[in-house]
């Protein structure tokens, strides 16, 4: 994992996350529910697992939320299609390292990406989609916590 | 207006180095990733890597890799691309390109920059 | 790297005429790819994005399809301001590859 650093701005994301995250939230329908909230599975994911579910979840955002989430706010859509730009440029640097066989998908890891997306699935899409979007920081707050993220001068 | 600036024709001898710049104006510098890409004459293009102007944070494509470097001055919203130990085959016309930024994201190299012709000539 | 090959590399249309650019990509690239537009001496121009997304401000007649490894540009009814090399560009994976380029002439 080591030689597997996501060279991004974590900083820059959270920054602009933290702008728009009270406007976002405050659009979640389904307060009581959760999507990555309280998953107790991401807590427990083994340095081993890492890798793979940071690209399965990166995969998760990319190919699902930011597809079908639907802004009308040009202010925060702008500041969301700049957090997802930044999600496509760490998905990429995953797949090298997974090009270099240093990103193997084990059956925990697995399992953990499966129990988001079914979480997902149980709510209409764009309620779902917002609700994902509002827990962004549970996320970002994970990949802190679990890479070593190289912040380039 | 939104513009990328490069800087003019270099001229240089084989094994020296040249660095292009490339200004941005008529948008935030620090929103947007920027690509190099160069073109041989009467060649196709080449890719030859990015840089994160927000954090400084670059990919280079393995063929230049310990040869290039890329920088930016955010102070003066500027990327720089600067190429070493050049050789006859790098002459080139090479270009700084910005990457979009959409929903759902994507890439693509939506502004371009006029261009830069670097000819490495003993 | 992955390779990309475009075909033909050259051909010759008529104004009117409907145009289509093959790009075959050595492995499987998803929707990771697009089209560009380059007249001498010019930079290029970005057409088609994400394989089929059409580019703010370029013409409808101009359009993309395909995933994986075949993808096609088409242009529906060639104009006189269409006749220039196009680009296909893969990045799916590093480093991102352009095909050859197919130059697309006067008949």
């Known amino acids: 994992l080591r030689r597997c650093l996501i060279s991004t701005d974590m900083h820059h994301i959270e920054e602009s996350f933290q702008e728009i995250k009270r406007a976002i939230q405050a659009k979640d329908t389904f307060p009581n529910v959760t999507i990555l909230s309280t998953l107790e599975t991401l807590q427990i994911i083994k340095p081993l697992d890492v890798c793979c579910v940071t690209k399965n979840l990166l995969a998760f955002y990319v190919d699902r939320v930011f597809k079908d989430h639907q802004e009308p706010n040009p202010k925060i859509l702008r500041k969301i299609s700049s957090i997802a730009n930044s999600f496509l440029y760490m998905q990429k640097t995953l797949r090298q390292c997974q090009e270099q066989r240093q990103c193997h998908c084990r059956q925990e890891a697995t399992n953990a990406t499966r129990v988001i997306h079914d979480n997902y699935d149980q709510l209409e899409v764009h309620a779902a989609a917002i609700k994902s979007l509002g827990e962004l920081d549970v996320f970002l707050a994970w990949i802190n916590k679990n890479h070593e993220v190289m912040f380039s001068a | 207006q939104v513009q990328l600036v490069q800087s003019g024709a270099e001229v240089k001898k084989p094994g020296a180095s040249v660095k292009v710049s490339c200004k941005a104006s008529?948008?935030?510098?620090?929103?947007?990733?920027l690509h190099w890409v160069r073109q041989a004459p009467g060649q196709g293009l080449e890719w030859m890597g990015w840089?994160?102007?927000?954090?400084?944070?670059?990919n280079y494509a393995q063929k230049f890799q310990g040869r290039v470097t890329m920088t930016r001055d955010t102070s003066i919203s500027t990327a720089y691309m600067e190429l070493s130990r050049l050789r006859s085959d790098d002459t080139a016309v090479y270009y700084c390109a910005r990457d979009i930024v959409v929903l759902p994201p994507a890439i693509g190299f939506d502004l371009w920059g006029q261009g830069t012709l670097v000819t490495v000539s003993s | 790297a992955i390779q990309l090959t475009q075909s033909p590399s050259s051909l010759s249309a008529s104004v009117g005429d409907r145009v289509t650019i093959t790009c075959r990509a050595s492995q499987d690239i998803r929707s990771d790819f697009g089209w560009y537009q380059q007249k001498p001496g010019k930079a290029p121009k970005l057409l088609i994005y994400?394989?089929?997304s059409l580019q703010s401000g370029v013409p409808s007649r101009f359009s993309g399809s395909g995933s994986g490894t075949d993808f096609t540009l088409t242009i529906s009814s060639l104009q006189p301001e269409d006749f220039a090399t196009y680009y296909c560009?893969?990045?799916?994976?590093?480093?991102?590859?352009f095909g050859q380029g197919t130059k697309v002439e006067i008949k």
């Open positions: 840089i994160n102007p927000n954090s400084g944070g670059t």
């Open positions: 560009l893969q990045d799916y994976n590093y480093p991102w590859t």
């Open positions: 008529g948008y935030t510098f620090t929103g947007y990733y």
């Open positions: 994400a394989a089929s």
